[in-house]
């Protein structure tokens, strides 16, 4: 089990990179002037106490921002929000902090990120560009669910 | 007004086997982790397990491997513990508890009030 | 299996400040212990005060805070009450599993 964060670059089907604007992240064009986030994922250490086939449970966080995504209602709606934390101090809690965990499951390039504390509910972007990533219950042709992953370093 | 209510003292037989049963008001059980803990008279208090009611998923002090089985019905929002093979060892009071994470850390918020076994012929 | 353990029993004053310690058969008690400190008062009464060795459980007063101390947990009360006589359990993670102290009675007269 890798016990440092992994640092990645992450684009949507239409190549879209996820960009931070008034800390929230948003999807956008990839750009000469457009300056991606690097997004660091770890595996949970708990993964024996999880669901084995949803995918690989892994904390996300901005890489050197102190920035993690995690899942939270709204009301009766699940959101996804950047909370200020440390990706180590999620990785080295005695339990699997749920909120802060997604499964990570990779079909070919293509890889998806479902919520632990609200399964069914995944990463998304609209499929207009410029929109903040949300989480979507709805697979379909609104919002894009596939992201690819480019390992770095 | 989130609580954890235990069901009723048990005086039962040695050899017999026991269910005693937690259950949750004001939340959701599937969304936390409930403990189950042993505290015998004038001793300290020793850790059962823990389950994930989301999953069922569970883990277990070692000591308590094969002596004790938890598991959870969310439809009831309900835990349950099940104790085998009872021996006056057994003789205590059972908690469970909901260990929950704020901000940045886990913490035993909530407690129920306790069931009392007796194993006595 | 490790076993920790608490000062049996501990009287202070109101308005005093009195540590409780936690000690481990281990060696030193890190923040990888991530330590719990739990409240329990008559009639089976449970509140959890300090998880994370440092961090004070949502409601709980800030005369309760949680460190290090040496190669020992501790739970520091400033400024006792009264209604501060108790039994404190700590409580250390060890890998996958959770190891409870024999508890400190604190007396407050």
């Known amino acids: 089990k890798s016990e440092m964060p992994q640092p990645v670059s992450i684009q949507d089907i239409n190549h879209r990179v996820w960009v931070l604007q008034d800390q929230i992240l948003i999807a956008v064009p990839r750009k000469d002037r457009v300056s991606p986030v690097t997004i660091s994922l770890i595996s949970c250490r708990h993964v024996e106490t999880l669901e084995k086939d949803r995918g690989n449970p892994i904390y996300l966080g901005l890489n050197g921002l102190n920035l993690c995504l995690m899942c939270a209602k709204a009301g009766d709606q699940p959101t996804l929000q950047l909370k200020e934390k440390d990706i180590m101090d999620l990785y080295n809690q005695p339990e699997p902090v749920k909120s802060f965990l997604f499964y990570h499951s990779q079909s070919g390039r293509n890889s998806t990120f479902e919520s632990v504390a609200f399964p069914g509910w995944f990463i998304a972007v609209s499929s207009e560009g410029g929109c903040p990533l949300i989480l979507t219950q709805e697979l379909g042709k609104a919002n894009t669910t596939d992201f690819g992953l480019t390992m770095l370093f | 007004e989130v609580q954890l209510q235990q069901s009723g003292a048990e005086l039962v037989k040695p050899g017999a086997s026991v269910k005693l049963s937690c259950t949750a008001s004001g939340f959701n059980i599937k969304d936390t982790y409930i403990y189950w803990v042993k505290q015998r008279p004038e001793q300290g208090l020793e850790w059962i397990g823990r389950i994930d009611p989301a999953n069922g998923y569970t883990r277990y002090d070692p000591k308590f491997q094969g002596k004790a089985t938890m598991t959870a019905d969310t439809s009831s929002n309900t835990a349950y513990l099940q104790l085998s093979s009872l021996t006056s060892e057994d003789t205590a009071v059972y908690y469970c508890?909901?260990?929950?994470?704020?901000?940045?850390?886990?913490?035993?918020?909530?407690w129920g009030q306790g069931t009392t076994l007796t194993v006595s012929s | 299996q490790a076993v920790v353990t608490q000062e049996s029993a501990l009287t202070t004053s109101p308005g005093e400040t009195v540590t409780l310690t936690c000690r481990s058969s281990t060696g030193a008690v890190t923040t990888s212990n991530y330590a719990n400190w739990v409240q329990e008062k008559p009639d089976h009464l449970f509140t959890g005060l300090i998880g994370?060795?440092?961090n004070r459980a949502p409601g709980v007063p800030a005369r309760f805070s949680g460190s290090l101390i040496g190669d020992k947990a501790a739970l520091t009360i400033t400024g006792a009450q009264t209604e501060d006589e108790a039994i404190y359990f700590c409580a250390l993670w060890y890998s996958n599993h959770l190891v409870f102290g024999g508890g400190t009675k604190l007396t407050v007269l």
């Open positions: 508890a909901r260990y929950e994470y704020y901000d940045s850390s886990f913490y035993f918020d909530y």
């Open positions: 994370g060795t440092n």
